[in-house]
């Protein structure tokens, strides 16, 4: 029967007795930087070309027994997971292996850098189709390794890496922490995060998604027909590398940003038990398990968005946090979150010719996060309109006044330390969908975009008193671009998007008593692109 | 592995004096920084990636590496250039004493220097 991991990533329409999705990634080349491999294993024979690249440190220990089967174990298994005949994800993908890990599974940052450079030079000498680079390794945070990954990604290469097996924040490791790399955590057959003894999968905002990574059947280097089960975030990353190869084979022109957005979009949502993660990491960790798209074409009409969390600002009074979108994504909205509730909001601002989302800490606050909503919006022209604090009783407002521009997000930023001491407006005026409304002491920022066929609408859900969380979701066919809270009092910890749902978190004041003035409303801005939908219909 | 201690005898101990005459300080207003792995057990002191500024050409990378060797030799230190990077990042990989870091950080074109560290199969 089909192994659990292949079943998990396969949409129901392909599920038969066998895993046989269309086009197994035949147009794509996958580079594997790992241990040596057993290239004559039946599972990968003829599919993997062993390059002459080798840069590994000496093995440790005086009694080390170098046995080929042990030296090849990790790499052989991963090659099998990516493209193995029987147990592989992308059975049509061809692979090239570079040896950067020794027989003990240890390598160096410098060896990995030289390996990445080798790939870039190979790409320049002999340009082929789409390239995927699988990095099933991790070390401590490395500025230079992250920089090299960034350069390779900007040269059009898709890099996929293991989040790490340290039961820790993936942002503390490289290349997992490189924003341009697709970083993969590991889940098991029960959709639980993988535990590896005391350790386990890494987590946090630097993880893009999870994939099967426990008891994964694959090629064993013990013999040319042997199979073995292995576990780890390497195995999870190999699944995503295989899925990426399939997607790129079906749509070779996909950019890295488009591929990442599709991987997120087609993932299974909210299936991971978040209780496994440390409490402070749950909100930052994506609850996504990778899956193949239900059809290889026809996703183009979708307006794709993802949520990007910043690093924590730190607790100093003037501390700020910045969340950035990828180069070919548009920042459609910006929000902020603080566990203590002490924050001074957020604003969208230009930095290096691109909009970024900046959140501001407040005096006595433990720090803030900035949360960017990053979307794929071709031919978009977006700008930020700002209204200074109104000081008047009904609050501050700003709208999109340019012809053809629609509101995609609202942000508010204030200088006063505690908005809660200033009476907020009780109700938000209705009937003006292209308008952001906020506290009279706050400056309000509207993200206004013009793009072919773009239409947006505002959805709200309010409750009379804060009860921890208020949510509002966009309906089928619409994509959440903006998420904010009204009225933004000190009870509100912040707002953020989880998939297509806007979540507003607030302190539970049911125990301290509350008034109607402490009502909290979650405001979602939902958009769709008629232009993308029409274009995709014309293709079909 | 070609960076073993035994290879130090190959090292160049002195270079053309004109190399030494070139400016030793980085461009005005920029300070190169040093980075190392936060996890001490994974550090590999003695090997460093010297990363040069983005638009640095291969010839400049090679010249900077030679200059480091010359200046180190004048101070009685052996160094070995293990690899010159180009294609992704400009720079070079050097085996040298940590005592030379201050000197290396002052070389022209240097953006930052990172001590090598271990990575592991996951």
């Amino acid at each position: 029967s089909i192994p659990w991991n292949l079943e998990r990533i396969t949409p129901p329409r392909y599920r038969a007795d066998e895993y046989q999705p269309p086009d197994g990634g035949s147009l794509v080349e996958v580079y594997l930087l790992d241990t040596s491999i057993q290239s004559d294993h039946r599972e990968i024979e003829g599919r993997v070309m062993v390059t002459d690249f080798e840069n590994v440190p000496e093995e440790d220990g005086t009694r080390f027994h170098r046995q080929a089967s042990k030296c090849d174990s990790h790499g052989t298994h991963l090659a099998g997971v990516v493209s193995g005949r029987d147990a592989g994800v992308a059975k049509g993908a061809s692979m090239r292996s570079l040896r950067v890990l020794n027989c003990q599974g240890k390598g160096t940052v410098s060896g990995t850098l030289i390996g990445l450079e080798f790939i870039r030079k190979s790409q320049l000498v002999q340009p082929v189709g789409p390239l995927v680079v699988l990095l099933p390794l991790a070390g401590g945070y490395s500025r230079v390794l992250n920089a090299a990954c960034q350069r390779l990604a900007r040269a059009g290469v898709v890099l996929v890496t293991a989040a790490g097996n340290f039961r820790d924040d993936a942002c503390l490791y490289s290349p997992a922490s490189a924003p341009e790399v697709i970083t993969v955590g590991a889940t098991n057959a029960q959709d639980q995060p993988v535990t590896l003894g005391t350790l386990g999968t890494n987590f946090g905002r630097c993880v893009d998604l999870f994939a099967p990574g426990e008891d994964i059947i694959g090629a064993s280097s013990d013999c040319s027909t042997c199979f073995v089960s292995q576990s780890g975030t390497s195995q999870a990353a190999a699944h995503v590398a295989g899925i990426a190869a399939m997607m790129l084979s079906a749509e070779p022109e996909l950019t890295l940003a488009e591929l990442r957005q599709r991987l997120i979009h087609f993932s299974a949502k909210d299936v991971i038990n978040e209780a496994w993660f440390p409490e402070d990491q749950r909100v930052l960790t994506p609850n996504l398990v990778a899956a193949l798209p239900p059809s290889t074409h026809g996703a183009g009409w979708q307006l794709f968005c993802r949520t990007v969390w910043s690093a924590h600002s730190g607790p100093t009074r003037m501390a700020t946090a910045i969340a950035r979108c990828a180069p070919d994504e548009e920042l459609l909205s910006c929000s902020s979150f603080s566990r203590s509730g002490k924050r001074r909001g957020e604003r969208m601002e230009a930095q290096g010719g691109k909009l970024v989302c900046r959140a501001h800490n407040a005096f006595g606050g433990e720090g803030v996060y900035a949360i960017a909503r990053c979307c794929l919006l071709p031919q978009a022209n977006c700008s930020v309109h700002t209204a200074p604090p109104a000081e008047a009783s009904m609050g501050t407002r700003v709208h999109c006044h340019q012809q053809g521009h629609v509101l995609t997000g609202c942000s508010s930023h204030w200088e006063v330390e505690d908005l809660g001491t200033h009476k907020p407006p009780v109700l938000r005026p209705r009937g003006q969908p292209n308008q952001c409304v906020g506290h009279r002491e706050a400056s309000i920022h509207a993200s206004c975009c013009h793009a072919p066929g773009l239409e947006c609408k505002v959805k709200e859900h309010g409750i009379p008193a804060p009860q921890g969380q208020v949510t509002v979701a966009c309906e089928e066919g619409w994509t959440l671009t903006g998420c904010s809270a009204l009225p933004g009092t000190s009870h509100v910890l912040g707002a953020y998007a989880v998939d297509n749902t806007c979540v507003v978190r607030s302190r539970d004041v049911s125990t301290t008593g509350s008034t109607s003035e402490e009502a909290v409303t979650a405001v979602a801005i939902c958009c769709r692109s008629r232009h993308l939908a029409q274009a995709s219909q014309e293709l079909q | 592995q070609e960076d073993e201690d035994g290879d130090y005898e190959e090292l160049v101990l002195a270079l053309r004096s004109e190399e030494d005459g070139l400016a030793e300080a980085p461009e005005h207003g920029t300070t190169a920084t040093f980075h190392r792995c936060a996890k001490d057990p994974w550090r590999l002191p003695g090997t460093y990636v010297v990363v040069l500024k983005e638009e640095t050409h291969l010839s400049q990378s090679e010249r900077t590496a030679r200059r480091l060797q010359a200046q180190a030799a004048r101070r009685g230190y052996l160094t070995k250039i293990l690899h010159v990077f180009h294609g992704l990042l400009p720079g070079f990989l050097v085996k040298m004493s940590g005592d030379l870091l201050e000197l290396a950080l002052k070389l022209p074109h240097v953006d930052y220097i990172e001590e090598d560290s271990s990575v592991f199969a996951q």
Epitope: G61, H65, N165, F166, L196, G197 | P41
Partner: antibody, heavy 122, light 111 residues
């Protein structure tokens, strides 16, 4: 439930041999390094030996080097300690313990057996 | 003779805080991960802290670890009678190619 159960302890004369076993259950045995640690009566912990997950490398304390051999049978989920040329100072409770990390991090030991007593006496 | 030195004993009243030091060298604590183990009377040791300051699941946050240079410290706050035990630090020693334990510290809860 993760379990380690030691066996094979007993009273033995100096110069003789003994083989300890440790049966593992509840985890993927072949993914973890394994240690032997001992504790003499009224004394502290003393590390004895370590074997890698795949058996490819072994490390020993100086006090047992050349006399003790650590080994494992991954198909049987069992760890062994072959003790030859036993001495009175080898008298201790012997614990088997699992290495924290599947690979090469030397993080320490996270799961311990209850121990088996070895008494070396004439 | 152990290469890691700990105080033989520390004591404090319930609810108080105690710290246990572990002194080593650059070949062990200075450049390797430190773990702390608790051994209750008559039982096998139990892992409390690994990677200097990380707690396995199930270990309360009353236990904390830190490292500075070639020394490591275990802190126990809100001391309870159930914390009476021997505590050992441990780390790899790169020069010896061996794992080494500290001399051990007996914690006594007064009263």
């Amino acid at each position: 439930e993760v379990h380690l159960v030691e066996s094979g302890g007993g009273v033995v004369q100096p110069g003789r041999s003994l083989r300890l076993s440790c049966a593992a259950s509840g985890f993927t045995f072949n993914s973890f390094g394994m240690h032997w640690v001992r504790q003499a009566p009224g004394k502290g912990l003393e590390w004895v030996a370590l074997i890698w997950s795949d058996g490819s490398d072994e490390y020993y304390a100086d006090s047992v080097k050349g006399r003790f051999t650590i080994s494992r049978d991954n198909s049987k989920n069992t760890l062994y300690l072959q003790m030859n040329s036993l001495r009175a100072e080898d008298t201790a409770v012997y614990y088997c313990a699992r290495a924290i990390a599947a690979l090469y991090y030397y993080y320490g030991m996270d799961v311990w057996g209850q121990g088996t007593t070895v008494t070396v006496s004439s | 003779e152990s290469v890691l030195t700990q105080p033989p004993s520390v004591s404090a009243a319930p609810g108080q805080k105690v710290t246990i030091s572990c002194s080593g060298s650059s070949s062990n604590i200075g450049n390797n991960f430190v773990s702390w183990y608790q051994q209750l009377p008559g039982t096998a040791p139990k892992l409390l802290i690994y990677d200097y300051n990380k707690r396995p699941s199930g270990i309360p946050d009353r236990f904390s670890g830190s490292k500075s240079g070639t020394s490591a410290t275990l802190g126990i706050t809100g001391l309870q009678t159930g914390d009476e035990a021997d505590y050992y630090c441990g780390t790899w020693d790169s020069s010896l190619s061996a794992y080494v334990f500290g001399t051990g510290t007996r914690v006594t809860v007064l009263g």
